[in-house]
């Protein structure tokens, strides 16, 4: 008889999850010489150990500490790019501007990007049928706790001028409930971070409003101020031109505003 399995509201673990994580790890360590020392089998074991056999609504940041330790990586000062609700453009940017890094350009973020996973209490099985949904089931699920843990660490280790890309098309350009708004912004360390510079990405071609005056940006400025960190904001009116100018800064059209 098949065992009874908890039904969650979210989609199940991504198919071939162990193989995907291992393959991504191998690929990453081959491409990044500074991470060649990393043993990918140990990384997978630590990843697995964080959620296998554990009730998937009772995962803690502590569960991920062995993995975090193995994936320790530093970003040079002034080279951290955070993002909120605009992942694709942030990643397109760091693919061109190779000396800047999002969390997903780091080993742990790269391993887990776009994947879902969970286990079951007291069994060594991975649940491919369903996993807890953050809203409908619980917030302390394997995926959410993972991103909270690595996002906190990514923000804590940032230094110099930190940049964040925000989606100007959303009703809340800065959302206190996003990972950036609830975790990263509160873990920037004033001893190391001189300033946060927000890039507000405009959606419409004819949108000439100054979105840096948006009330939610004032909320972000307030939080950053309370942390004794300077705040700057820039409108990126033409994201397509912005990327083009990152690729070809000498282009004559890039000397005017973006």
């Amino acid at each position: 008889l098949p065992r009874w399995r908890q039904q969650w509201s979210g989609s199940g673990t991504t198919s071939r999850f162990p193989e995907t994580v291992l393959a991504r790890c191998v690929k990453y360590t081959e491409v990044h010489p500074e991470m060649r020392h990393v043993d990918c089998q140990s990384v997978w074991d630590a990843f697995k150990g964080a959620f296998i056999s554990k009730y998937p609504c009772n995962i803690t940041e502590e569960d991920y500490q062995p993995l975090v330790k193995l994936g320790t990586q530093t970003v040079p000062c002034n080279k951290t790019l955070l993002w909120s609700r605009i992942k694709d453009l942030a990643h397109q940017f760091t693919q061109v501007q190779r000396d800047m890094f999002t969390l997903e350009d780091m080993l742990l973020g790269y391993l887990a990007d776009d994947l879902t996973w969970c286990g079951e209490f007291n069994t060594f099985e991975i649940n491919y049928q369903s996993c807890p949904d953050w809203r409908k089931d619980c917030s302390n699920n394997p995926v959410s706790v993972f991103w909270k843990t690595v996002s906190r660490r990514f923000a804590e280790t940032a230094c110099g001028v930190v940049h964040v890309m925000l989606n100007g098309s959303r009703s809340k350009i800065f959302d206190k409930n996003s990972t950036f708004g609830s975790v990263e912004v509160h873990n920037l360390q004033p001893e190391k971070v001189q300033a946060l510079e927000a890039w507000v990405i405009h959606g419409g071609r004819e949108d000439s409003r100054d979105l840096c005056q948006d009330p939610t940006i004032k909320e972000l400025e307030s939080i950053i101020s309370k942390r004794n960190i300077r705040f700057f904001c820039k409108n990126i009116y033409r994201p397509d031109k912005f990327l083009q100018c990152v690729k070809n800064p000498e282009d004559s059209s890039c000397l005017s505003g973006i």
């Epitope: 206190k176 001893e191 001189q194 009330p215 909320e219 400025e221 307030s222 004794n228 960190i229 300077r230």
Partner: antibody, heavy 123, light 107 residues
Framework: QIQLVQSGPELKKPGETVKISCKAS????????MNWVKQAPGEDLKWMGW????????TYAEEFKGRFAFSLETSASTAYLQINNLRNEDTATYFC????????????????WGQGTSVTVSS | ETIVTQFPASLSMAIGEKVTIRCITS??????MNWYQQRPGEPPKLLIS???TLRPGVPSRFSSSGYGTDFVFTFENMLSEDVADYYC?????????VGGGTRLEIK
């Protein structure tokens, strides 16, 4: 223990300049921003702005742009408020207050305040 | 900027009574409201900070509630030492703004 100690009362004539000090002790001065708050006689509190104690960068509320200047002496863990070209309406008590943030949670608070410096402007 | 309206402006209460002060904000400030007590000749003292958090050392008879635009500060069992001015301060967005204050006296 944490303390913010401000300089003593000032009696000035219109057009003169005053500089108020706020000396911090009991914590790492450069870790926390410093606010300045005005309280005119019989009136409520008005937030004037804040000073980044790492960089010395001031941020002023609209009403306090121009004649008001925040500055810093990091080695002495001291913040300053200077008011130029004093007017009668500058007569008030001025408070410094630090912005605290919790390291283990997202808690923020203007928690410790100086005792206040009374500035009287009268011809 | 966010306008903070505080009422009542003054309050006369008997010892032992329950005190209630209210602040309304012109914009949604989540729960970023702070409550201060200011006794004559003293600086403001923080009683409750963002998230309706009672500060260490502040008696548990003080409490606050509210989210968005409507906030209430209460304390049970008024004592003579509670005679003071009370202010609410929103710290959601710059510039930070303060309510007009409530003067509390003994009846």
């Amino acid at each position: 223990q944490i303390q913010l100690v401000q300089s003593g009362p000032e009696l000035k004539k219109p057009g003169e300049t005053v500089k108020i000090s706020c000396k911090a002790s009991g914590y790492t001065f450069t870790n926390y921003g410093m606010n300045w708050v005005k309280q005119a006689p019989g009136e409520d509190l008005k937030w004037m702005g804040w000073l980044n104690t790492n960089t010395g960068e001031p941020t002023y509320a609209e009403e306090f742009k121009g004649r008001f200047a925040f500055s810093l002496e990091t080695s002495a863990s001291t913040a300053y408020l200077q008011i130029n070209n004093l007017r009668n309406e500058d007569t008030a008590t001025y408070f410094c207050a630090r912005w605290y943030y919790g390291s283990s949670d997202n808690s923020y608070a203007m928690d410790y305040w100086g005792q206040g410096t009374s500035v009287t402007v009268s011809s | 900027e966010t306008i903070v309206t505080q009422f009542p402006a003054s309050l006369s209460m008997a010892i032992g009574e329950k005190v209630t002060i209210r602040c309304i904000t012109s914009t949604d400030i989540d729960d970023d409201m702070n409550w201060y007590q200011q006794r004559p000749g003293e600086p403001p003292k923080l009683l409750i900070s963002e998230g309706n958090t009672l500060r260490p050392g502040v008696p548990s008879r003080f409490s606050s509630s509210g989210y968005g635009t409507d906030f209430v500060f209460t304390f049970e069992n008024m004592l003579s030492e509670d005679v003071a001015d009370y202010y609410c301060l929103q710290s959601d967005s710059l510039p930070y703004t303060v309510g007009g204050g409530t003067r509390l006296e003994i009846k």
